[in-house]
C-alpha cells in the first residue's frame, strides 16, 4: 500500500512539475524590466526564450519572436535546449511512468518489469528536473552578469548633457516556475525511485534441509537470492524424506486473484 | 464616436477643494489608460495625472502629488481628479485625455476641458 | 524629469513654404525593447484642445495629411510641413511619451 502511495504520489509530483517546466518554457517573463531605483517609465519591457514584449502604459502590448537562430546568445540557446530536453525527458518519464503505476493493469506485465519502468521512470524525471533547474540557473546567472554590467554603464552620453538610461533587466516569474517546477519534478522522481526498490525487494530464500533419519550424509542444496514482488508467487518447500537426504525446490508463479486492483 | 467632457471646474479660493469630473463615452472606458492635463493662462501644457486601465495604477506630476488623486468609475464610465489645497499655480483649463492603445502611449482624443481659477 | 526643447518657438511663413520644427529630449525616448521612439507632436488652433498628429515620433494619426512628417530618434526629433496651408497656422507641442512625468515643450507658432 505504501509502494503504491509513494509511486502514486511520485507521478502526480512530477507530472505537476513537468507541467510546470513546460509552462515556464512558454513564458514570457524569464527577464523583466528592473523599476527599483529606476525613472519611471511608460513602457514595461520583459523577455522569454522565444520572444520579447513591451506592455505600455496604453493598455498595448507587443511581442515580436526571436526569428533569428544564429544571431541569439550562446547562452540564450544553451538554456532552451537544457528546458526542452527536459520537457521530452519528463513526457517520455510519464508515458513509461502511465504503464509502470501498480494500480494500472497492462495484461499479465510481471511487477519486475513494473519495477524496472519505474526505476527509469524516476531516473527521466530526475534528469528532466535537473535539466530544468539548470537552464533557469543558467539564465539567471547571465541576467545576473548583464544587471552589474549595465549598473556599471547605467548612463551612457556625450558630455552627460544627453543622457540614454540602460534598460536593466531582473528575475522574472518565469525564473521562479523554472525552479519550483524543476524540484518538484526532480522530487518525483526520487519517490519514483524509492518505490521501485519497495516493488522489487530483495529476498532471501532459506532451503529447507533434510535429514535421513539414519544419520547418513547430509546433501544441502543452498537457494541463491529471488527477487520478487510478494505478490502472486507461490513458494513451496517440499521436504522429502526417503531415505535420502535431499531438497526439492518448485518455485511457481501463476497471478492470483490478489495481483491487481 | 469617442467623446470626453468636463465638468466641475470654477472659481475658488487658495486652500480649497475642488472634484473635476470626465464623461466618456463611444468606447470601453474601463480599458483605456486616461489622463488630465492642464494648459495654463502662459498656454504650457503640463501633464498632471495617469491612471491605467485595467489595473488601476495611477501617476501624478510631483507639484500635485498628495494633493490630487485621479479615480474612475466604470460603471458610470467617468473619470475624477480630487484636488485638495488647492494653490494659485494651479490655475488653468483641465483636459480629460485618453492614451490610445496603438499610439504609443500618445493622447488620442482630448475633452474640450474645464476651467480652474484658484485666487482669493 | 524629462526636459523638453522646442526650436523655434514661433515662426512666420507663407503658404505652400515648407516648415521644419525641432524638439530635442534630455534623455532617449527610443525604447530598447521594440526600438521604438516614444514621442508625441500635437497641433493647437486658437480656442480649441490639442490634436493628436505624430505618434511613435513618425507615425501619423489617421486623417492627418500626409504633408505631415515626423522624424528623429533617441533625443533629436523634427515635425516637417512639407507645404503649408491656411489651417496649418497653430501651436505645435511635442511631448514625452516614455518617462513620467510626461513632459510637453514649450510649442512652437506657426504664424502668418
Known amino acids: 500500500m505504501a509502494v503504491t502511495a509513494c509511486q502514486g504520489l511520485g507521478f502526480v509530483v512530477s507530472l505537476i512539475g513537468i507541467a510546470g517546466i513546460i509552462a515556464a518554457t512558454c513564458m514570457d517573463q524569464w527577464s523583466t524590466q528592473d523599476l527599483y531605483n529606476n525613472p519611471v517609465t511608460a513602457v514595461f519591457n520583459y523577455q522569454g526564450l522565444w520572444r520579447s514584449c513591451v506592455r505600455e502604459s496604453s493598455g498595448f502590448t507587443e511581442c515580436r519572436g526571436y526569428f533569428t537562430l544564429l544571431g541569439l546568445p550562446a547562452m540564450l540557446q544553451a538554456v532552451r535546449a537544457l528546458m526542452i530536453v527536459g520537457i521530452v525527458l519528463g513526457a517520455i518519464g510519464l508515458l513509461v511512468s502511465i504503464f509502470a503505476l501498480k494500480c494500472i493493469r497492462i495484461g499479465s506485465m510481471e511487477d519486475s518489469a513494473k519495477a524496472n519502468m519505474t526505476l527509469t521512470s524516476g531516473i527521466m524525471f530526475i534528469v528532466s528536473g535537473l535539466c530544468a533547474i539548470a537552464g533557469v540557473s543558467v539564465f539567471a546567472n547571465m541576467l545576473v552578469t548583464n544587471f552589474w554590467m549595465s549598473t556599471a554603464n547605467m548612463y551612457t552620453g556625450m558630455g552627460g548633457m544627453v543622457q540614454t538610461v540602460q534598460t536593466r533587466y531582473t528575475f522574472g516569474a518565469a525564473l521562479f516556475v523554472g525552479w519550483v517546477a524543476g524540484g518538484l519534478t526532480l522530487i518525483g522522481g526520487v519517490m519514483m525511485c524509492i518505490a521501485c526498490r519497495g516493488l522489487a525487494p530483495e529476498e532471501t530464500n532459506y532451503k529447507a534441509v533434510s535429514y535421513h533419519a539414519s544419520g547418513h550424509s547430509v546433501a544441502y542444496k543452498p537457494g541463491g537470492f529471488k527477487a520478487s514482488t510478494g505478490f502472486g508467487s507461490n513458494t513451496k518447500n517440499k521436504k522429502i524424506y526417503d531415505g535420502g537426504a535431499r531438497t526439492e525446490d518448485e518455485v511457481q508463479s501463476y497471478p492470483s486473484k490478489h495481483d491487481y486492483v | 464616436e469617442v467623446m470626453l467632457v468636463e465638468s466641475g471646474g470654477g472659481l475658488v479660493k487658495p486652500g480649497g477643494s475642488l472634484k473635476l469630473s470626465c464623461a466618456a463615452s463611444g468606447f470601453t472606458f474601463s480599458s483605456y489608460t486616461m489622463s488630465w492635463v492642464r494648459q495654463t493662462p502662459e498656454k504650457r501644457l503640463e501633464w498632471v495625472a495617469t491612471i491605467i486601465g485595467g489595473y488601476g495604477n495611477t501617476y501624478y506630476v510631483d507639484s500635485v502629488k498628495g494633493r490630487f488623486t485621479i479615480s474612475r468609475d466604470s460603471a458610470k464610465n467617468t473619470l475624477y481628479l480630487q484636488m485638495i489645497s488647492l494653490r494659485s499655480e494651479d490655475t488653468a483649463l483641465y483636459y480629460c485625455t485618453r492614451l490610445g492603445q496603438t499610439q504609443r502611449n500618445a493622447m488620442d482624443y482630448w475633452g474640450q476641458g474645464t476651467s480652474v481659477t484658484v485666487s482669493s | 524629469d524629462i526636459l523638453m526643447t522646442q526650436s523655434p518657438s514661433s515662426l512666420s511663413v507663407s503658404a505652400g513654404e515648407k516648415v521644419t520644427m525641432s524638439c530635442k529630449s534630455s534623455?532617449?525616448?527610443?525604447?530598447?525593447?521594440?526600438?521604438?521612439?516614444?514621442l508625441a507632436w500635437y497641433q493647437q488652433k486658437p480656442g480649441q484642445p490639442p490634436k493628436l498628429l505624430i505618434y511613435?515620433?513618425?507615425t501619423r494619426e489617421s486623417g492627418v495629411p500626409d504633408r505631415f512628417t515626423g522624424s528623429g530618434s533617441g533625443t533629436d526629433f523634427t515635425l516637417t510641413i512639407s507645404s503649408v496651408q491656411a489651417e496649418d497656422l497653430a501651436v505645435y507641442y511635442c511631448q514625452n511619451d516614455y518617462y513620467y512625468p510626461f513632459t510637453f515643450g514649450a510649442g512652437t507658432k506657426l504664424e502668418l
Open positions: 511613435g515620433a513618425s
Open positions: 534623455q532617449s525616448l527610443l525604447n530598447s525593447g521594440n526600438q521604438k521612439n516614444y
